[in-house]
């Protein structure tokens, strides 16, 4: 779990190793100087972009080695009791629709990343949040309309998907169906939350990969 101290440290990207090296170099040169993080990130990003494939190779090797370490450690890692593997997700199940904010982020993330290349994923997300909060309700409307349409489509698709998956459900009694409805809805809410987290994780991973490509 998130709080498990025994859980192997996450694998680092080549760019992360490069930034770490930059930090160490900076500390050696200026041991007492405080670091302006956004300036430092920007400089790192600019340096990374101008580096040759050969120069990046060293960091890529470090990332490969760290990936191997992570995979090796994960094989022997036993999660704490009660922390079970996520339930199986049917790849054919309709994908949960994005929220209005998620759609908005897809529009404006390139702008923020383009204008502030050194920003971390967290800072990009923070800036997007600020932009969304400062956007007038009517400027949010197109995203909200699209999200509502996608939600409607998802609800139809998921109903069809469930009906297809349980052809004998109709034969069961109405009373039993009503009883289980509330429990089912609670389960669905949990699933939805998991899906949302997963989508965010996937996006973060994609962004890390983008950083690697820079």
């Amino acid at each position: 779990g998130k709080g498990d101290p025994k859980k192997p440290r996450g694998k680092m990207s080549s760019y992360a190793f490069f930034v770490q090296t930059c930090r160490e170099e900076h500390k050696k040169k200026h041991p007492d100087a405080s670091v302006n993080f956004s300036e430092f990130s920007k400089k790192c990003s600019e340096r990374w972009k101008t580096m040759s494939a050969k120069e990046k190779g060293k960091f890529e090797d470090m990332a490969k080695a760290d990936k191997a370490r992570y995979e090796r450690e994960m094989k022997t890692y036993i999660p704490p009791k009660g922390e079970t593997k996520k339930k199986f997700k049917d790849p054919n199940a309709p994908k949960r629709p994005p929220s209005a904010f998620f759609l908005f982020c897809s529009e404006y993330r390139p702008k923020i990343k383009g204008e502030h290349p050194g920003l971390s994923i967290g800072d990009v997300a923070k800036k997007l949040g600020e932009m969304w909060n400062n956007t007038a309700a009517d400027d949010k409307q197109p995203y909200e309309k699209k999200a509502a349409k996608l939600k409607e489509k998802y609800e139809k698709d998921i109903a069809a998907y469930r009906a297809k998956g349980k052809p004998d459900a109709a034969k069961k009694g109405v009373v039993k169906a009503e009883k289980s409805k509330k429990k089912k809805e609670e389960e669905e809410d949990e699933e939805d939350e998991e899906d949302e987290e997963e989508e965010e994780d996937e996006e973060d991973e994609e962004e890390e990969e983008d950083d690697d490509d820079e």
Epitope: E107, Y108, T135, A136, A137, D139, Q141, K146
Partner: antibody, heavy 119, light 108 residues
């Protein structure tokens, strides 16, 4: 330097069509929400339509709904306004403008192109 | 739709004087969504103020915006010859995004 250059205006008969273009330069076009604003002779400014950075989201004034279509080609750094079923009251100078951040207020404008609807 | 009414329609002043332009909204607005523009004949409109009081990039400090609710003001502290133009207020809190009819600032 940010530049917006409108073209495609001219004289058209009522019921006719016209396609306005706005060529953008000096900034990363695909990052910005863009808009069309018009000014009828002797009148004030009137917002017409706006489009999101990717072109996936559009919004129109009631006077433009169903007749005008805003679009963009990010590979060509160009904004468009397709105007159909034109009426005399559509006669105006049409400006394209760039939205600052995500708000519907505009920090850079073109010089405008005149559309005259008359028989 | 939110109507924006500007007053006066025309303001005749001399360079060096202070100009106060008013804008009234037909319903209460958050100042966050009010902008002011300057427009000269044959030129592109120019954004002066957004968010009610934030000066746009490159706008001289003599221009300032204030107000809340339904009443908003653009003040030009000391008029320069190049400031004579038409000024528009705009609300962008709800669509349609509406402008005032404009205030013409002319040389006395």
């Amino acid at each position: 330097e940010v530049q917006l250059l409108e073209s495609g205006g001219g004289l058209v008969q009522p019921g006719g069509s016209l396609r306005l273009s706005c060529a953008a330069s000096g900034f990363t076009f695909s990052y910005y929400m863009m808009t069309w604003v018009r000014q009828a002779p002797g009148k004030g400014l009137e917002w017409v339509s706006s489009i999101s950075p990717s072109g996936g989201y559009t919004i129109y004034a009631d006077s433009a709904k169903g007749r005008f279509t805003i679009s963009r080609d990010n590979s060509k750094n160009t904004l468009y306004l397709q105007m159909n079923s034109l009426r005399a009251e559509d006669t105006a100078v049409y400006y394209c403008a760039r939205a600052l951040s995500t708000g519907s207020f505009w920090d850079y404008w073109g010089q405008g192109t005149l559309v005259t609807v008359s028989s | 739709d939110i109507q924006m009414t500007q007053s006066p329609g025309t303001l005749s002043l001399s360079p060096g004087e202070r100009a106060t332009l008013s804008c009234r909204a037909s319903e209460s607005l958050t100042s966050t969504y009010v902008a002011w523009y300057q427009h000269k004949p044959g030129q592109a409109p120019r954004l002066l103020i957004h968010g009610g009081s934030t000066r746009a990039t490159g706008i001289p400090v003599r221009f300032s915006g204030s107000g809340s609710g339904t009443d908003f003001t653009l003040t030009i502290a000391t008029l320069e010859p190049e400031d004579f133009a038409v000024y528009y207020c705009q609300q962008y809190g709800s669509s349609p995004y509406t402008f005032g009819q404009g205030t013409k600032l002319e040389i006395k």
